[in-house]
């Protein structure tokens, strides 16, 4: 029975050349988090494994930093970084929870954080 919910930073925006923290939080479950995957569309950015720690995909090593916590920091943002990001929580005994974040990278300095929202 999957009782948990994932809270994410929702729709967010950031300036080109800057950095942004992608953050998800799993609540309302006592399930053990065994692994968290961060993905952009269908590309794997990073994995945080309970036994092995962090693994950053080679193609993102220069621009992705682990943390804080189970979150992910994207650096040196470009307009091409605009899009959907997913945090995938692998848990036991519940199973897999997925959260979605939409990031918009802006040319100017009008970037603002969107509201938080929940995904069951």
């Amino acid at each position: 029975m999957m009782t948990g919910t994932i809270e994410t930073t929702g729709n967010i925006s950031a300036e080109k050349g800057g950095s942004i923290i992608l953050q998800c939080h799993l609540s309302s479950t006592t399930a053990q988090v065994t692994q968290v995957n961060w993905e952009q569309q269908d590309q794997l950015l990073a994995i945080c494994n309970a036994d092995l720690g962090w693994h950053i995909s080679p193609s993102f090593k220069d621009r992705v930093a682990p943390g804080p916590g189970l979150g992910l920091t994207l650096q040196s943002l470009t307009v091409n970084d605009t899009g959907e990001y997913f945090c995938i929580y692998h848990t036991y005994p519940d199973g897999t929870y997925t959260g979605r974040i939409f990031l918009e990278v802006l040319e100017s300095s009008v970037a603002e954080h969107g509201a938080r929202f929940q995904i069951p």
């Epitope: 065994t34 994995i47 036994d51 692998h90 005994p93 897999t96 997925t98």
Partner: antibody
Framework: EVKLVESGGGLVKPGGSLKLSCAAS????????MSWVRQTPEKRLEWAAT????????YQPDSVKGRFTISRDNARNTLYLQMSSLRSEDTALYYC?????????????WGQGTSVTVSS | DIQMNQSPSSLSASLGDTITITCHAS??????LSWYQQKPGNIPKLLIY???NLHTGVPSRFSGSGSGTGFTLTISSLQPEDIATYYC?????????FGGGTTLEIK
Amino acid sequence: EVKLVESGGGLVKPGGSLKLSCAASGFDFSRYDMSWVRQTPEKRLEWAATISSGGSYTYQPDSVKGRFTISRDNARNTLYLQMSSLRSEDTALYYCARQDYRYPYIMDYWGQGTSVTVSS
Amino acid sequence: DIQMNQSPSSLSASLGDTITITCHASQNINVWLSWYQQKPGNIPKLLIYKASNLHTGVPSRFSGSGSGTGFTLTISSLQPEDIATYYCQQGQSYPWTFGGGTTLEIK
């Protein structure tokens, strides 16, 4: 080349015990979750147990909980399945399988299997 | 437990045909579905993961699609070496469960 070789199967009476082994080679065993999957005489596939890369976490379906214990020795590149209180419905071909590091539910390589028959 | 229902249970087709196998999950499993191929007398091999991603070395005539509760495995231009039983498996929640299999024969 990924190679998984199971051993230890055989004929055992109901209520008896058996210990299966799986010798792994061709990859960094200590960085992968590993599983046992069984195939019944009717050719149905059933997940039996999984252990995390460092051995910190084990996962099992209710059907074998308390009867089967999965363990590993990373120094010896070997996976084990200790089976006790065996029942006729445990009769199956037992496969050792490696989990994909990206998605823990995926069995990306399988061994040849070892046969377990529970009969009086 | 999530039930995985495969259809048909057996299928006969001619070389060069395009065939489709379906897998229905009893509840939403997002895209957490794999397909495996087991040739007669052989071991299961991973074909497709995350519903539509081809595993390394799998020919491009194999494709997967679907999300939620409905999934399909399509084999185009059927080859003699495709004779096998095909299984789907869900990874959305524990226990991980498999479909009953679809056995493919050549006419």
